[in-house]
């Protein structure tokens, strides 16, 4: 899976969309999880309604919401009041049994609010690396990760 970058402004809402084959994933609940480290587990943040037929109902966990258009095949995650600590690598997942298939890998970047003149030093952006393959740039707030970018800040 290539990684798609979604950029949002601190303090505002960010919508992440994850398209999928609606027939292939028919009947399956979805989830949004945060990757803990480059090879670590993906920690569940929020999942769609327990009854798949009600997946269109928005479910919240804190400031994160999820809703699923099961006919159109689009999972939408909303991160409300985006904060610097929300930056990082996430996954949209399709659940079956206790397993989860990755629908999309997402890198969330948090940009400084241009109207906020406070120190933006704690805002995080990806560093340099050569661990990711070529990927095309997508529209507006989202793009695929460029070659040479890494989704985790240096640990040293």
């Amino acid at each position: 899976h290539n990684t798609t970058v979604f950029q949002g402004v601190a303090g505002q809402s960010l919508q992440v969309s994850c398209p999928y084959d609606s027939m292939k994933h028919w009947g399956r609940r979805k989830a949004w999880c945060r990757q803990l480290g480059e090879k670590g587990p993906c920690q569940r943040v929020v999942s769609t309604h327990n009854l798949w037929l009600l997946s269109f109902l928005r479910r919240w966990n804190g400031s994160t919401a999820i809703t699923d258009d099961t006919l159109g095949g689009t999972l939408t995650i909303t991160l409300r009041n985006l904060q610097p600590h929300d930056a990082g690598l996430y996954q949209c997942q399709s659940l079956h049994g206790s397993e989860a298939d990755t629908l999309r890998k997402v890198l969330v970047e948090v940009l400084a609010d241009p109207l906020d003149h406070r120190d933006a030093g704690d805002l995080w952006f990806p560093g340099e690396s050569e661990s990711f393959e070529d990927a095309h740039v997508e529209h507006s707030i989202s793009r695929s990760l460029l070659e040479g970018e890494i989704p985790f800040p240096p640990t040293s």
């Epitope: 084959d21 206790s98 397993e99």
Partner: antibody, heavy 123, light 107 residues
């Protein structure tokens, strides 16, 4: 009426190749996953792997990975199971089965099965 | 892999009897379990899915229960056509695995 029709019985020699088929009808072939299950003579059922014909996404049991190849041709609603070099131990009945996800619990179960293809490998 | 263990491996019973077959998973599988019936020379047939949901067209004398690691299939009043082999199967994770089977024979 939903049907999975498998190809006929095969008698082969060790080292030969083989490809058996499973043709689905009465439903949209790109809406369901298709699994292959082995049953050796007088034994139980063994899940070999599964394929989604829409994009050929395939999962194998570790026990069968590298031993067989599962493929599909969505244009003719057919899934395949093939061997490049058969062994006597491959002698078994092979079933294909449609995997249906039940939205009650978001997991999948085998609701329709083919009649089975008996493969005999003997020198 | 998750191991599925059925007991007994065979059982003799008479028409009208109540029969219970058990299936134990080597780890918790929530309610992701199915039961199949297989007759000699035939393909398996789905009876129960999600541990307790009756597949369409299956007689109501068949019922399933359990969650986690322990599951049961019950036939409330055996009919002549019920003499067959029964398999449980976990739908929790790949690879899907089946129990070794329970052969139900006429006493």
């Amino acid at each position: 009426e939903v049907q999975l029709v498998q190809s006929g019985a095969e008698v082969k020699k060790p080292g030969e190749s083989l490809k058996i088929s499973c043709k689905g009808s009465g439903y949209s072939h790109t809406s369901y996953w298709i699994a292959w299950v082995r049953q050796m003579p007088g034994k139980g059922l063994e899940w070999m792997g599964i394929i989604y014909p829409g994009d050929s996404d395939t999962r194998y049991s570790p026990s069968f990975a590298g031993q067989v190849t599962i493929s599909a041709d969505k244009s003719i609603s057919t899934a395949y199971l093939q061997w490049s070099s058969l062994k006597a131990s491959d002698t078994a009945m092979y079933f294909c089965a449609r995997s249906r996800t039940f939205y009650y619990d978001s997991s999948d179960y085998f609701d329709y099965w083919g009649q089975g293809t008996l493969v005999t490998v003997s020198s | 892999d998750i191991q599925m263990t059925q007991s007994p491996s065979s059982v003799s019973a008479s028409v009208g009897d109540r029969v219970t077959i058990t299936c134990r998973a080597s780890q918790g599988i929530s309610s992701w379990l199915a039961w199949y019936q297989q007759k000699p020379g035939k393909a398996p047939k789905l009876l129960i899915y999600a541990a307790s949901s009756l597949q369409w067209g299956v007689p109501s004398r068949f019922s399933g229960s359990g969650s986690g690691t322990d599951f049961t299939l019950t036939i409330s009043s055996l009919q002549p056509e019920d003499f067959a082999t029964y398999f449980c199967q976990q739908a929790d994770s790949y690879p899907r695995t089946f129990g070794q089977g329970t052969k139900l024979e006429i006493k």
